[in-house]
């Protein structure tokens, strides 16, 4: 029977900069029941606070709801593991909410085959940013990535769309049914999950671009 091993806070994520959650990995338990507590203070403060919500984020997590989340202040946090034989602390972790945003997937993905008379046909893909992300404030720059593949293919073809919310693809296999998905990330944040797939049938007379 031993004191617990050192825990590690390894992940923090915010869906929209208004709330966030951090997760830790327990160290060894020393063969005894172990209690974990996360304490934090914000830059410029000395007063330590305990995690406001150990439930919402699941096991070994701390969730900071709206009233506990500030974009203006860096959070300094650590996890304490305690059993009957003693305690151990994680390293201190510094968190700036700006840099942990992982948005929801983009919305309203629309895919259409366009066949203009005077130009080569193309696949036109359009989407909207996730609702929880406020792009009007200006500090949020969302970047987008599209992936598509014929229904029975194993490999995805990936296209980086930058900040655009629409994209054209010229090279497609005629007569195939394609799956199309899109995801987004803030410049210094994390990729969202892929949006639900949209299916599109490419007409047999679709001319491949050379």
């Amino acid at each position: 029977q031993l004191p617990p091993g050192k825990p590690e806070i390894f992940k923090c994520r915010s869906p929209n900069k208004e709330t966030f959650t951090c997760w830790w990995r327990p160290g060894t338990d020393g063969g005894l029941p172990t209690n974990y507590s996360l304490t934090y203070h914000r830059e410029g403060e000395t007063l330590m606070h305990e995690c406001p919500d150990y439930i919402t984020g699941g096991p070994n997590s701390c969730h900071f709801g709206k009233q506990y989340t500030s974009m203006w202040r860096t959070y300094i946090m650590m996890v304490n593991a305690t059993n009957q034989m003693g305690s151990s602390f994680s390293d201190e972790l510094y968190v700036d909410v700006t840099y942990i945003v992982q948005p929801d997937p983009p919305l309203e993905l629309a895919v259409e085959v366009k066949q203009p008379e005077d130009r080569k046909p193309y696949l036109w893909i359009k989407w909207s940013p996730p609702t929880l992300i406020d792009l009007k404030t200006g500090w949020f720059t969302l970047l987008y990535e599209i992936r598509l593949k014929p229904e029975k293919a194993a490999e995805w073809e990936i296209h980086f769309a930058g900040q655009q919310t629409e994209f054209k693809i010229l090279s497609l296999h005629p007569g195939q049914k394609y799956l199309v998905q899109v995801r987004c990330k803030p410049d210094h944040g994390y990729w969202s999950a892929w949006s639900p797939a949209t299916f599109i049938q490419i007409p047999s007379d679709f001319t491949m671009n050379d």
């Epitope: 590690e8 410029g44 203006w72 860096t74 968190v95 700036d96 840099y99 500090w139 210094h188 990729w191």
Partner: antibody, heavy 118, light 112 residues
């Protein structure tokens, strides 16, 4: 204990490439961005670029774009910085550095001296 | 790119005396999220840089309270209230509000 251990000194010919490694330990490698910064002899610090090891997303200083490639090998918790078309002005100590969930550098490697000379 | 200008270039200080380093940026360092990402690093002789102050005025873990940072917008100052022998080295200000991140030219602090 967080450690960033870099590869040894290199001497290179003008026009060639160099690949410097930075092996991370003491934390979950994919959690935090790795940055590369260089320091020419007797000079100040210059930021080269950064990588998010979780998905290999990179941002580069435009000054080095096209000449620099930053990559990671998650299986060995190692970041790499490759600089091509070397010239004498690239002679410098190259540092890797790690952020937290922030954009400043909390931990630094010991540095790797790259000398470009004919 | 944002140009960071540090003054003075070098500073010779008697132990126990204060020291002050100025850093000026060519553009405001206020991020569109409201934060100011101006930091101070110290590079001791023969060592890698180490973080002293983050976001203008916050001491990093383990940094003695004789170090303090202040300023806003484009003008920033690092103060050492009582210089000690272990404080010798080159001090750099750095901004990470705008990409590419940039550093000042450095201020060398030595003991008289």
């Amino acid at each position: 204990e967080v450690q960033l251990v870099q590869s040894g000194a290199e001497v290179k010919k003008p026009g060639s490439s160099v690949k410097v490694s930075c092996k991370a330990s003491g934390y979950t490698f994919t959690s935090y961005w790795i940055h590369w910064v260089r320091q020419a002899p007797g000079q100040g610090l210059e930021w080269i670029g950064e990588i998010d090891p979780s998905d290999s997303y990179t941002n580069y200083n435009q000054k080095f774009k096209g000449r620099v490639t930053i990559t990671v090998d998650k299986s060995t918790s190692t970041a790499y910085m490759e600089l091509s078309s070397l010239r004498s002005e690239d002679t410098a100590v190259y540092y890797c550095a790690r952020s937290f969930f922030t954009n400043w550098f909390a931990y630094w490697g010991q540095g790797t001296l790259v000398t470009v000379s004919s | 790119d944002i140009v960071m200008t540090q003054t003075p270039l070098s500073l010779s200080v008697t132990p126990g005396q204060p020291a002050s380093i100025s850093c000026r940026s060519s553009q405001s360092l206020v991020h569109s999220n409201g934060n100011t990402y101006l930091h101070w690093y110290l590079q001791k002789p023969g060592q890698s840089p180490q973080l002293l102050i983050y976001k203008v005025s916050n001491r990093f873990s383990g940094v003695p309270d004789r170090f303090s940072g202040s300023g806003s917008g484009t003008d920033f100052t690092l103060k050492i209230s009582r210089v000690e022998a272990e404080d010798v080295g080159v001090y750099y200000c750095s901004q990470s509000t705008h990409v590419p991140f940039t550093f000042g030219g450095g201020t060398k602090v030595e003991i008289k």
